[in-house]
């Protein structure tokens, strides 16, 4: 496969990753799909430094990240270990709140207006951030 050595147009490079910030909203699954079609993934936050970088770019707006617990435990979309990794939840979150009246609980994580994380209904149309790593071999299958 080929390697990506620079970020695509309209993406922002930071610490050997490329980031794209939406200015419109989608449900979590549709945002996830959008990133994957760009050969990327919803942003995975692995450090306080990366948290501050993303927060600076999104401003005080609810924004999806690549973290969900739709199948039980919390999981990052790229396989990064949740239990041992960076976390920045708001106090008393995640709470899987059922009181919103939309059916079910809250299975998808987003940045809130102050940057800290909250779990929310995955169908809400929030903005999102895509991320892809530089110098990573693409997923192109080998020629047969």
């Amino acid at each position: 496969g080929s390697e990506r050595t620079c970020c695509p147009v309209n993406w922002v490079e930071h610490e050997r990753s490329c980031y794209w910030f939406s200015r419109s909203g989608k449900a979590w699954a549709d945002a996830d799909n959008y990133c994957r079609l760009e050969d990327a993934h919803l942003v995975v936050v692995t450090s306080w430094e990366e948290q501050k970088f993303v927060q600076h770019h999104i401003g005080p707006v609810n924004t999806w990240m690549g973290l969900h617990d739709q199948n039980g435990p919390w999981k990052w979309v790229d396989g990064t270990d949740y239990e041992t990794g960076f976390k920045n939840w708001r106090p008393e979150q995640p709470d899987d709140w059922y009181g919103h009246g939309l059916g079910g609980g809250e299975d998808c994580a987003h940045f809130t207006d102050d940057g800290r994380w909250n779990d929310d209904v995955c169908q809400r149309p929030y903005r999102w951030v895509c991320e892809t790593e530089l110098d990573k071999a693409s997923q192109e299958p080998p020629l047969l």
């Epitope: 496969g1 309209n10 939406s22 419109s24 989608k26 050969d39 149309p125 693409s138 997923q139 299958p141």
Partner: antibody, heavy 121, light 106 residues
């Protein structure tokens, strides 16, 4: 000039297989996701399948899942649709198109001229 | 899936007429809407993307408007080459198309 040219359509019996190709030119093929859309005679357009620029991610309509496989060969600037277990209701003109995504929304441009697939005994 | 409804399925008009073609989504799709023109035996051609942005090379007599669930394609002064089928498409979620509105000569 950006161009897409489909081939591989034809008459096939129910349960049979066919592989469609879409040859691309005039743009950096590997930088764009690509799609297949079909149109049954006298009907509207129906999205079939999409593949990312690298080929690493695909997704398809429920109506073809498990039967149709989208793939691409970026070294040949070619998109494919492998169609197995064909049914009469798969009879349609099949179009390939380039997916353009800039602002979070997406659109399809240009489209190939289409290739007709007829499933009949 | 999100359903896209185009009614009427056909519309008659004359050259020079102002024509408005509606499209309705089964749920809020914000501005994730595109319009395509298709002539018999030909491939679809993109006219409008993101509800109101005119595709390069498309005549300015075409315009799109709307947001949420209700959208319109307007042709300000119908030309002979505009008689065709017009389809809307949403890309908020898994892509779906309307059934199309056929524009006929009156």
């Amino acid at each position: 000039e950006v161009q897409l040219l489909e081939s591989g359509g034809g008459l096939v019996q129910p349960g049979g297989s066919l592989r469609l190709s879409c040859a691309a030119s005039g743009f950096t093929f590997s930088s764009y996701a690509m799609i297949w859309v079909r149109q049954a005679p006298g009907k509207g357009l129906e999205w079939v399948s999409t593949i990312s620029g690298s080929g690493g991610y695909t997704y398809s309509a429920d109506s073809v899942k498990g039967r149709f496989t989208i793939s691409r060969d970026n070294s040949k600037n070619t998109l494919y649709l492998q169609m197995n277990s064909l049914r009469a209701e798969d009879t349609a003109v099949y179009y390939c198109a380039r997916r353009i995504a800039v602002t979070g929304t997406e659109w399809y441009d240009p489209w190939g001229q289409g290739t007709l697939v007829t499933v009949s005994s | 899936d999100i359903q896209m409804t185009q009614s009427p399925s056909s519309l008659s008009a004359s050259v020079g007429d102002r024509v408005i073609i509606p499209c309705r989504a089964s749920q809020n799709i914000s501005s994730y809407l595109n319009w395509y023109q298709q002539k018999p035996g030909k491939a679809p051609k993109l006219l409008i993307y993101a509800a109101s942005s005119l595709q390069s090379g498309v005549p300015s007599r075409f315009s799109g408007s709307g947001s949420g669930t209700d959208f319109t394609l307007t042709i300000s002064s119908l030309q002979p080459e505009d008689f065709a089928t017009y389809s809307c498409q949403q890309t908020y979620s898994t892509p779906t198309f309307g059934q199309g509105t056929r524009l006929d000569i009156n």
